[in-house]
């Protein structure tokens, strides 16, 4: 039967009807509406927007729309005691101070409640000392400083450029190196594309622009005071000293005009190589301290931000399924922004709004999806994925039993070059099939499919004629669903040309200049890329909620498992002597992958042949597909990261944004040559191989015939 017959509605209500109802003009209108004032998490403005969205989703036709509130730890600057950084002379006089705010963009000069740039959750403090430039503050940058250059960061204030890795990892690395403060800045090498003007004349970062952001190392915990459990009315809260993931040293972000003033005086060691130089006209000396004439000058940080338990609000909308109401497909994206949120998150929220409107239109005409669709407008994503994580903690028992899929919907664009998709391998075929049916919005691809333009512009490194699909990492609201609960997840957005644009993210990310005008003037004047992203996200949700057999292909998991096993084996084989000495074998893992491949193949054959009119068998097969992702969850979690429980994927320990495969084995092998007790270290590698092999084998067995 077709999905239309299964839900007993008129045939015209198919995917095409849903997609045809999506309109670029509506997305544009919603984006404008969502970006006129700041919507910082925990503020009255963001509460009002939550209520507006609740009201509009009800009007659109959802069955119910509720606010789910939590009281979580947030962080704000002190309004009367601003944060800044000084250069002080030998007498302690401040001879230079960094800017207290970003110059507001044209048309926004009189907007109130623009939060000044700050690093959320920085502790208070006024450290002073010599500066050390640490490049991107990655693990390898500190290895270079400490091991090769013999530069000690202990007791120093470090200055690091944004980019390459999540800022929280930079701060963690600086703390471990003994630094007493961190200055983060945006170097034009990473946030200024050549040949493009700075805002408001183009989409580049001006010298006074600054990237805000949280600097937590939560590792999936959610609210720092209530890890594992919802921050509800009767929650037991940890003391601040026991809070999860808070930084221990002051941190503050600045723009490149201010960074120039700090970096131009740097003395000490020259940069180790050209990869440590940015685009400012400064020597990029590492330090420590200032050069000759300025050697008696020091840097002083003045940080007075406060951490406060504050109420946040998620909006949860429900469109009840007609056939399997106890199976949930979730579309979620956040609503809170650092300032106006022109791209992050409102370009995504506007798309979700239009998807809800389209589904609502179909529902008003008598249609229902086969499965229940949940729509979510998350709060406090910018403060550590708090809204989504608290809701998932509160509803974890329902989600682990009923969660079919989660589709994330943060920023719809980070460029306008081609599609970018990160998802579970279970969704590869869904994404391929869907994009073959959608029209490409790209210039030069008129009349061609999205699949074709995407494959041409972003080819898979492994399979010719196919597009690149990346691993899920973190840094967004899918984290709790995928990494903790094992619910199949995916995300899609339009992106830049990574080959020609080497800057990190998009230049105006988390700055005051992320406005409606930025999108409307420079990124997507016709909102055609937004519409395409709406079609991809909405189309995925439609298929996941409405197809009779879940559109998951377990054979694609088999393929990547083999690839990941090969990769981790080759990393381990860089130490052949130790592998021999400690009897390290990957046989169990490769055997488990082989078994998974064979069982997945047989399952796929049965999936083609079974009687789809038998609702019990249909439900049984779909449950095996739904629970496959869940089977990769280890209830004990990864070492020291109990909320990262997926054995195949986890956020990299060195960069939260990036996904790592077989993360348990990878982390056990990382820098193993420097471990003080090699026997213990290789023992942990063997244990992680055992855990991975067992998990893959156990997952394979969930696909076997049930009896």
């Amino acid at each position: 039967k077709s999905s239309n017959e299964a839900t007993n509605i008129t045939p015209k209500h198919n995917m095409k009807a849903f997609l045809d109802e999506l309109k670029a003009e509506n997305i544009k209108k919603f984006l404008y509406n969502f970006t006129q004032i700041p919507h910082l998490a925990g503020t009255e403005q963001n509460f009002q927007l939550a209520k507006q969205i609740q009201s509009q989703w009800k009007e659109f036709g959802l069955d119910s729309v509720e606010l789910a509130h939590y009281d979580v730890l947030l962080s704000y600057p002190n309004k009367t005691h601003p944060n800044y950084i000084s250069i002080i002379n030998e007498d302690g006089n401040e001879i230079f101070n960094t800017s207290l705010f970003e110059p507001p963009p044209p048309g926004y000069e009189n907007v109130s409640d623009i939060v000044p740039p700050f690093s959320a959750f920085s502790p208070q403090g006024m450290p002073e000392g010599d500066l050390v430039y640490v490049n991107y503050a990655r693990t390898e940058d500190f290895f270079k400083l400490e091991r090769d250059m013999k530069i000690n960061c202990s007791g120093k204030i470090v200055i690091a450029r944004y980019g390459k890795v999540f800022r929280g990892n930079k701060v963690k690395n600086a703390q471990l190196a003994g630094a007493k403060g961190v200055i983060l800045y945006s170097d034009p090498a990473d946030y200024f594309a050549p040949g493009v003007k700075s805002y408001p004349d183009g989409w580049n970062l001006p010298g006074g622009g600054v990237q805000r952001g949280n600097i937590l190392n939560l590792n999936g915990a959610g609210d720092p005071l209530t890890p594992g459990y919802p921050a509800n009315e009767y929650a037991y809260r940890r003391g601040i000293a026991e809070a999860v993931g808070l930084p221990s040293i002051p941190v503050h972000p600045i723009g490149y005009y201010d960074a120039q003033k700090l970096l131009e005086k740097m003395g000490g060691s020259a940069p180790p190589d050209s990869s440590w130089r940015g685009s400012l006209k400064v020597p990029y000396n590492v330090g420590p301290g200032f050069t000759g004439n300025f050697s008696t000058q020091k840097v002083k940080m003045h940080i007075h931000s406060t951490n406060e338990v504050t109420r946040i609000y998620n909006v949860i909308g429900t469109l009840r399924g007609a056939v399997e109401p106890d199976r949930y497909v979730i579309l979620g994206g956040h609503r809170d922004s650092w300032v106006f949120g022109g791209i992050d998150p409102q370009s995504g929220a506007a798309v979700v709004h239009e998807i809800v409107r389209s589904f609502g239109t179909l529902k008003k005409e008598g249609w229902r999806p086969r499965r229940t669709i949940l729509f979510a407008s998350w709060d406090a994503e910018e403060f550590g994925l708090l809204g989504s994580t608290e809701w998932a903690e509160e509803n974890s028992r329902l989600l682990q039993e009923r969660g079919v899929a989660y589709i994330n919907a943060d920023s719809s664009i980070e460029g306008n070059y081609t599609l970018r998709v990160d998802c579970t391998p279970l969704m590869y075929s869904l994404v391929h099939n869907l994009t073959k049916e959608l029209k490409s919005p790209d210039e030069g691809f008129e009349g061609k499919s999205l699949y074709e333009s995407w494959t041409k512009k972003s080819p898979s490194p492994e399979f010719s004629g196919m597009p690149r699909i990346s691993k899920l990492g973190s840094g967004n609201d899918f984290e709790v669903f995928f990494q903790r609960l094992g619910i199949a997840s995916g995300r899609a957005r339009y992106t830049k040309n990574w080959e020609t644009n080497k800057f990190s993210g998009y230049p105006l990310y988390h700055s005051v200049y992320e406005t409606y005008e930025l999108v409307e003037k420079f990124y997507d004047p016709m909102f055609k890329y937004h519409l395409t992203v709406a079609q991809v996200r909405g189309g995925m949700v439609f298929e996941l909620a409405n197809s009779i057999v879940l559109p998951f292909d377990c054979r694609d998991y088999a393929v990547v498992l083999r690839k990941y096993a090969d990769k981790i084996y080759s990393i381990s084989m860089k130490h052949p002597q130790e592998m021999k000495t400690y009897s390290v074998s990957f046989d169990s893992l490769f055997s488990a992958v082989k078994n998974f491949t064979e069982i997945a193949s047989k399952f796929s054959e049965r999936l083609q042949d079974f009687d789809k009119s038998n609702p019990i068998v249909l439900r049984m097969m779909n449950d095996q597909l739904m629970f496959l992702e869940r089977a990769f969850i280890d209830p004990l979690g990864l070492p020291d990261r109990p909320f990262y429980r997926h054995v195949i994927y986890a956020p990299s320990s060195h960069n939260k944004y990036a996904g790592e495969s077989f993360p348990g084995i990878y982390d056990a092998l990382f820098d193993i040559e420097s471990k003080v007790d090699p026997s213990k270290a290789w023992g942990e590698v063997k244990r992680q191989i055992y855990v991975a092999a067992f998990t893959v084998q156990a997952a394979a067995e969930t696909l076997s015939e049930v009896a």
């Epitope: 001879i95 230079f96 200024f192 006074g208 003033k261 685009s279 006209k281 990029y284």
Partner: antibody, heavy 120, light 112 residues
Framework: QVQLVQSGAEVKKPGASVKLSCKAS????????INWVRQTPEQGLEWMGG????????NYNENFKGRVTMTRDTSKSTAYMELSRLRSDDTAVYYC?????????????WGQGTTVTVSS | DVVMTQSPLSLPVTLGEPASISCRSS???????????LHWYQQKPGQSPRLLIY???NRFSGVPDRFSGSGSGTDFTLKISRVEAEDVGVYFC?????????FGQGTKLEIK
Amino acid sequence: QVQLVQSGAEVKKPGASVKLSCKASGYTFTYFDINWVRQTPEQGLEWMGGISPGDGNTNYNENFKGRVTMTRDTSKSTAYMELSRLRSDDTAVYYCARDGNFPYYAMDSWGQGTTVTVSS
Amino acid sequence: DVVMTQSPLSLPVTLGEPASISCRSSQSLVYSNGNTYLHWYQQKPGQSPRLLIYKVSNRFSGVPDRFSGSGSGTDFTLKISRVEAEDVGVYFCSQSTHVPYTFGQGTKLEIK
């Protein structure tokens, strides 16, 4: 828009000092260095030095060291250049120019110039 | 100090014809970050200089696209593809890679 407005023409005797001003508007004064450049028919354009309004740090051309002093008043968004022990060959048009910072690192805005005549 | 040498010092050109000015520095103008801080300024009669080209080849805002810059290391060129009457004036090359900043002697462009 960015504007640099300089003080009026000066006539000075040899051995005297002259102090010129340059008032900036249309941008954040402390973000951009102010350079002083003079122009004579004989020497062409000569960079005399610059000042960082943010911290008052100065960088002088060796040819003028000991005779030139650059200061600023951030409350007035004004930079000053004083040249002492004037000689007849200091007769020139003196320009202040904003150092354009990234991505230019060139003098992207110039004052209208101040003519200084040194004559006994 | 870095010496900047321009040629020719005088350049008579017919309207609509191209013009080219050369500038040579006494040492490399490549800064440690890989950028070359060689700029061109235009000074029209009775006016202050104004920035034309920055970092060898980048036109400053509002500069017509008939102006272009090229070169590397120590040898640089300013080209005007089709000279117009308003282009009359003196053109200076300048470097800000090394302190002190220095200028060329200037090339006077006039209409034949």
